[in-house]
Amino acid sequence: ASNKTTLQKMGKKQNGKSKKVEEAEPEEFVVEKVLDRRVVNGKVEYFLKWKGFTDADNTWEPEENLDCPELIEAFLNSQKAGKEKDGTKRKSLSDSESDDSKSKKKRDAADKPRGFARGLDPERIIGATDSSGELMFLMKWKDSDEADLVLAKEANMKCPQIVIAFYEERLTWHSCPEDEAQ
């Protein structure tokens, strides 16, 4: 198998341009890695890293549209191995983790989808910051204890009602000089 996936059905965006479904020869993109799996309305979807694209272009795609069985199998095996490892007794482990496990954790964290890429429904904004130079919201997701920092402009588009609710709750109409940064 070639790991090529025909994205005719989804109309996947490439460099911001939506692929047209009616194209005679739909463009094929190459899957580099399968990063995550979820079930939505009873259908299995995989979170994919695309060859030649950055992590920002990672997408969730339905299993039925994919033609990369080896990559899916590799992902499922890695999940299984991880579970088996977690299930074993840890008596032999010293207090300090090995460098290998630390770097694996770092890799896993880097591979983990963040923000809206997690495919979860936003529940509420629990804070905001512009410390990185761009306004970010700390977003709490439904059915998850993990919150992520997401770009405010992305939230404005993807969940305007959540953003409005946040501003309504947090808006104060009086201005206290002591509450303003220099």
Partner: antibody, heavy 121, light 112 residues
Framework: AVQLVQSGAEVKKPGESLRISCKGS????????ISWVRQMPGKGLEWMGR????????NYSPSFQGHVTISADKSISTAYLQWSSLKTSDTAMYYC??????????????WGQGTLVTVSS | ASALTQPASVSGSPGQSITISCTGT?????????VSWYQQHPGKAPKLMIY???KRPSGVSNRFSGSKSGNTASLTISGLQAEDEADYYC???????????FGGGTKLTVLG
């Protein structure tokens, strides 16, 4: 002016329950999270958790989750920290605090005067 | 998450500059520009000196400044004054499960 006024010092026995309070004034109480911070005698600050008084949504530090309960009554602009069964190791000064801005994530700019809790048999 | 690492004590003479470091991990200090610094005099409540890495609340002297490099945040106090003698704590957002974590504190002594 923004004020956070905490309830007075408490002396309790191990196993007893306790609720201490923090009353906010001089600002819109429901627009700002209230955090609780512990300082054991001669030790540093420890972040315990926070509550959004508008709907009582909470975040707890894993170290304190299950040991304390943070609540709020927005009708009287008051946040609470409570224990169902105190231990001697709960002896500490407890501060409530409020962010500088309504949306601040992990910094607090206004502090209560602190409530000293002593647990001793 | 375990506490952020700060030196136990730092000292300097009036007029000098001192820097207090606060070392975390890639899960807290390194991941977010959300470090705050607090000053605490004996028997008093803490006072916010710096937030979001380098922002100063109004009323705080511009002798206090904050910065960050990698997993380490720093508080610099220039033109040291006697009243700066206090304990200083750093604090960082540490992800949604831990939320916030403080450093162990640094005792600043102003000599002479």
């Amino acid at each position: 002016a923004v004020q956070l006024v905490q309830s007075g010092a408490e002396v309790k026995k191990p196993g007893e329950s306790l609720r201490i309070s923090c009353k906010g004034s001089g600002y819109s109480f429901t627009s700002y999270w209230i955090s609780w911070v512990r300082q054991m005698p001669g030790k540093g600050l420890e972040w315990m958790g926070r509550i959004d008084p508008s709907d009582s949504y909470t975040n707890y530090s894993p170290s304190f989750q299950g040991h304390v309960t943070i609540s709020a009554d927005k009708s009287i602009s008051t946040a609470y920290l409570q224990w169902s069964s105190l231990k001697t190791s709960d002896t500490a000064m407890y501060y409530c605090a409020r962010p500088l801005q309504t949306y601040s994530i992990a910094s607090v700019g206004h502090w209560g005067q602190g409530t000293l809790v002593t647990v001793s048999s | 998450a375990s506490a952020l690492t700060q030196p136990a004590s730092v000292s300097g003479s009036p007029g000098q500059s001192i820097t207090i470091s606060c070392t975390g991990t890639s899960s807290d200090v390194g991941s977010y520009n959300l470090v705050s610094w607090y000053q605490q005099h004996p028997g008093k409540a803490p006072k916010l000196m710096i937030y979001e890495g380098s922002k100063r609340p109004s009323g705080v002297s511009n002798r206090f400044s904050g910065s960050k490099s990698g997993n380490t945040a720093s508080l610099t106090i220039s033109g040291l004054q006697a009243e700066d003698e206090a304990d200083y704590y750093c604090c960082s957002y540490a992800g949604s499960s831990t939320f916030a974590v403080f450093g162990g504190g640094t005792k600043l002594t102003v000599l002479g």
